[in-house]
């Protein structure tokens, strides 16, 4: 029986050109997290595997950084980044938990969760 719940940042907005941290949190279960997938609609952004570490999809490599923790940081946001993002937690023995975040990228200055990482 799956007892866990996923908490996400929910609906968030950020400024065009800015940064955002996407975070999900799995609670209320003792299941071991074996992998977390981050997806944008049907497109894979990144995988965080407990044994293999991070894999960032090549098309996002220059503006995505892993972390903090199992989260994901998106940089240099464009209006095209507006949409649904999913964190998919693969766990043992529970199975799969999915969380949803809706990101709206705005032209105005309504940025949240500004990230501190830099990619030269």
């Amino acid at each position: 029986m799956m007892t866990g719940t996923i908490e996400t940042t929910g609906n968030i907005s950020a400024e065009k050109g800015g940064s955002i941290i996407l975070q999900c949190h799995l609670s209320s279960t003792t299941a071991q997290v074996t992998q977390v997938n981050w997806e944008q609609q049907d497109q894979l952004l990144a995988i965080c595997n407990a044994d293999l570490g991070w894999h960032i999809s090549p098309s996002f490599k220059d503006r995505v950084a892993p972390g903090p923790g199992l989260g994901l940081t998106l940089q240099s946001l464009t209006v095209n980044d507006t949409g649904e993002y999913f964190c998919i937690y693969h766990t043992y023995p529970d199975g799969t938990y999915t969380g949803r975040i809706f990101l709206e990228v705005l032209e105005s200055s309504v940025a949240e969760h500004g990230a501190r990482f830099q990619i030269p």
Epitope: V33, D62, P66, G67, Q118
Partner: antibody, heavy 117, light 107 residues
Framework: EVQLQQSGTVLARPGASVKMFCKAS????????MHWVKQRPGQGLEWIGA????????NYNQKFKGKAKLTAVTSASTAYMELSSLTNEDSAVYYC??????????WGQGASVTVSS | DIVLTQSPATLSVTPGDSVSLSCRAS??????LHWYQQKSHESPRLLIK???QSISGIPSRFSGSGSGTDFTLSINSVETEDFGMYFC?????????FGGGTKLEIN
Amino acid sequence: EVQLQQSGTVLARPGASVKMFCKASGYSFTSYWMHWVKQRPGQGLEWIGAFYPGNSATNYNQKFKGKAKLTAVTSASTAYMELSSLTNEDSAVYYCSREGGYGMDHWGQGASVTVSS
Amino acid sequence: DIVLTQSPATLSVTPGDSVSLSCRASQSIRNNLHWYQQKSHESPRLLIKYASQSISGIPSRFSGSGSGTDFTLSINSVETEDFGMYFCQQSNSWPYTFGGGTKLEIN
């Protein structure tokens, strides 16, 4: 087997700079953050910053911005930390550790830096 | 920055005792809390990840609990090899931070 091999002991003068290394083996170097942690004698652990070799992303503790510079040579699976304008307060053991999202699961043996005139 | 406060600073116990070490965060960090053990003149070692998840190779007498701001590392029947320093660390937000540590010593 995952291993993080760090530089040896360094003795430096106040005002000088030192660059230490952390050579990784046994895993995909570009898939993990490399963290650097400071420990003064008899004290706790202090997070300096981290470098992600996958795309050269960095994150610093504000306290160490301007003091520590983190870099890496991916082809050599080696991370570096340069400490500048050394003072007695920089005398410590410095650890590198890797993190792939699930805690810092492997640590180097530590590199000792002593600043003395 | 998130401040992690560990208590007690020192804990004197007898082998065979069961103990609890506390780590309190200055704001909610959900379950993004990890525990490390450091023996004298050694590097830290990861004991527990994400507040309660076990680590391969770590004895089952070590367990973790908590969420939000209050976390506990429990050692069921302390053995002599368990004496040393214990640190908590958060990965909820940058910059990562460590607690000040709890020293577990022989009574």
